[in-house]
């Protein structure tokens, strides 16, 4: 099919088409009151796309100022544009908020490329398509930035959903989600369904389309199929997990599993690509090239730089392999695997050739800071950030793009020994010197 089948975002909600649904497995965990079921008001509350990030609407201040905020599980600051910028349609105007409190403290966040800096304060914050609560949260008012805001992305700030340990300027600055849980009865859990379109969206299409769902405080059954499988959060800073095995089309990469997690593996909605440590990236690309050898592509494509185009509807998905990441399970010596399709790791790009072509960038790239399971991975799955139980759950997303032959999968259990040895122990240095490089 032209762009692969895109499953509907929901079944029977708000008049959405029923479309194709994968059969639900029956061996699910028992219901947990208040944490599972239907969260209709939060379904479809995200917009955006993998290349520029997914954002949720939030209000800040009194009277409320509405802003679109990037959902980022790879950082821990709530930071919003607070001064005019060429790429911002609107920004937080602290002087107009009667509830703003200045913390009289600055914050500076450098990235590998770019940076932002601002002034810390607190204000009242709510999420219109979220829980019906208002919380006083720390806010970094961004006054200066470089290569941070994205032209045409339609978001004006960032919601860092990771833990206090990586908050800037230091771990004493309480992240938004911690404030939310402390001040309300919202359970300490959120879940994300990021929906890649499978084809490029222009600016107006992004604004009109659904990008997915952020369910705050629970799990919505309509957003996934099959079972949820959980992997432990190794350490509460980033959402760090442990990968124990990697396969390309079922072929084991056969590397020391420590390499997969060197120097960490994280789940990060604010990163576009699946990023892999240098050695792992090279082995993976070699294997993907071998699997797709009936066609050859230039080196620049494998570096994520050049676009490859095919006549519309003729993208040869079948020549590209599936990629499986095995994650440590909750039970000793037990793992499970998540499998993504080329429909996830070939990212559709705005048409730079002609409207008669479908063009893609290779969305797996090299990392010097460990594995980053970015949007291209997350777009295949419904991902549950169960902070209360220090675990992350994966299930097949009801909106993932696939074709008639293959689908993304979450499968287990598998027997895997010595999984603890797969984790890398970072030498203890001052964490504040870490660069937060993202791509």
């Amino acid at each position: 099919t032209q762009h692969g089948i895109r499953l509907p975002l929901r079944s029977g909600l708000g008049g959405a088409p029923l479309g194709l649904r994968l059969p639900r497995e029956t061996d699910e965990e028992p219901e947990e009151p208040g944490r599972r079921g239907s969260f209709v008001e939060m379904v479809d509350n995200l917009r955006g796309k993998s290349g520029q990030g997914y954002y949720v609407e939030m209000t800040v201040g009194s009277p409320p100022q509405t802003l679109n905020i990037l959902v980022d599980t790879g950082s821990s600051n709530f930071a919003v544009g607070a001064a005019p910028h060429p790429f911002l349609h609107r920004y937080y105007q602290r002087q107009l908020s009667s509830t703003y409190r200045d913390l009289r403290k600055g914050v500076y966040v450098p990235y590998t490329q770019g940076k932002w800096e601002g002034e810390l304060g607190t204000d009242l914050v709510s999420i219109p398509h979220g829980p019906n609560v208002t919380v006083r949260a720390n806010i970094a008012a961004i006054t200066e930035s470089d290569k941070f805001f994205i032209n045409g992305s339609n978001w004006e700030g960032i919601l860092g959903l990771a833990y206090a340990e990586i908050a800037r300027p230091d771990d004493s600055l309480e992240p938004f989600f911690d404030s939310l849980v402390k001040q309300t009865h919202v359970p300490n859990l959120f879940s994300l369904q990021l929906c890649g379109a499978g084809f490029p969206l222009n600016q107006s299409e992004v604004l009109a389309s659904v990008g997915g769902s952020m369910i705050i405080g629970g799990i919505d059954h309509s957003l996934y199929t099959g079972s949820l499988w959980y992997t432990p959060i190794r350490r509460e800073w980033y959402y760090e997990v442990i990968i124990v095995r990697v396969e390309i089309n079922g072929q084991d990469l056969k590397m020391d599993c420590k390499e997969y997690n060197y120097d960490k593996s994280i789940v990060d909605s604010g990163t576009t690509n699946l990023r892999l440590p240098k050695k792992v990236f090279e082995a993976a690309v070699k294997s993907i090239k071998a699997a797709s050898s009936t066609e050859k592509f230039p080196d620049g494509f494998w570096l994520g730089e050049q676009l490859v185009c095919w006549q519309a509807g003729t993208t040869p998905w079948n020549i590209f392999p599936v990629i499986s990441l095995y994650l440590m399970g909750e039970v000793t010596n037990q793992s499970f695997r998540i499998t993504i399709l080329p429909q996830q790791y070939l990212r559709p790009v705005e048409d730079v050739a002609t409207s008669q072509d479908d063009c893609y960038k290779f969305a797996i790239s090299q990392s010097s800071t460990g594995t980053v399971m970015g949007a291209v991975i997350m777009e295949g799955f419904y991902v549950v950030f169960d902070r209360a139980r220090k675990r992350i759950g994966f299930a097949v997303s009801a909106c993932h793009v696939h074709d008639e032959f293959r689908t993304a999968a979450v499968e287990g259990p598998f027997v895997t020994l010595d999984m603890e040895d797969c984790g890398y122990n970072i030498p203890q240095t001052d964490e504040s010197t870490l660069m937060t490089g993202r791509a």
């Epitope: 050859k296 620049g300 050049q306 676009l307 063009c359």
Partner: antibody, heavy 120, light 108 residues
Framework: QLQLQESGPGLVKPSETLSLTCTVS??????????WGWIRQPPGKGLEWIGN???????YYNPSLRGRVTISVDTSKNQFSLKLSSVTAADTAVYYC????????????WGRGTLVTVSS | EIVLTQSPATLSLSPGERATLSCRAS??????LAWFQQKPGQAPRLLIY???NRATGIPARFSGSGSGTDFTLTISSLEPEDFAVYYC??????????FGGGTKVEIK
């Protein structure tokens, strides 16, 4: 030293099919290091890419010519061919075959070209 | 579609002079750009690839520069055999498809 040589009729009638062959000598068309392509140049005008082929048979075509163009490869003869159907006077051009090298990116070796005139 | 605009259309210079040819892309093509030389009655010849790398056998007087949207081919001192038409081509979008309209370097 690898060389490319185009061959085929120099005159084709309107609405008929233009057929050209490129013979590769001094090297193998089955090399995994190259794609092979066709480019044309109307008299006094610029260059227009027609399409590419890999020895496995995988093809890419210029969107403006799709539906009319077919490129095929015969590894046993070390040749690849171009067919362009339903030709008009606008298809009159010098047709070049070329090798796409430098990591499949650049046309680094060209045939001398053959002029094909479409006229009744 | 990425459009490559070459300027000037014609450049009239004398042997020994420096020639500067421009190629502008309608959107960024990174460094994925080539320059070709074509003499009358001959096939094009690859001069420069990846914006600045000289192809095999190309004299050092030819140099390429630029990235993103603006590229330059410079011939430091024109030799009689350099009078020809020069084309740029982008390969950021693959397979390579777009050529510029050409710049003719003629004897003044």
């Amino acid at each position: 030293q690898l060389q490319l040589q185009e061959s085929g009729p120099g005159l084709v009638k309107p609405s008929e099919t233009l057929s050209l062959t490129c013979t590769v000598s001094g090297g193998s068309i089955s090399s995994s290091s190259y794609y092979w392509g066709w480019i044309r140049q109307p008299p006094g005008k610029g260059l227009e890419w027609i399409g590419n082929i890999y020895y496995s048979g995988s093809t890419y075509y210029n969107p403006s010519l799709r539906g009319r163009v077919t490129i095929s490869v015969d590894t046993s003869k070390n040749q690849f061919s171009l067919k362009l159907s339903s030709v008009t006077a606008a298809d009159t051009a010098v047709y070049y075959c070329a090798r796409l090298g430098h990591g499949y990116n650049y046309f680094d070796l060209w045939g001398r070209g053959t002029l094909v005139t479409v006229s009744s | 579609e990425i459009v490559l605009t070459q300027s000037p259309a014609t450049l009239s210079l004398s042997p020994g002079e420096r020639a500067t040819l421009s190629c502008r892309a309608s959107q960024s093509v990174s460094s994925y750009l080539a320059w070709f030389q074509q003499k009358p009655g001959q096939a094009p010849r690859l001069l420069i690839y990846d914006a600045s790398n000289r192809a095999t056998g190309i004299p050092a007087r030819f140099s390429g520069s630029g990235s993103g949207t603006d590229f330059t081919l410079t011939i430091s001192s024109l030799e009689p055999e350099d009078f020809a038409v020069y084309y740029c081509q982008q390969v950021y979008v693959w397979p390579p498809r777009t050529f510029g309209g050409g710049t003719k370097v003629e004897i003044k």
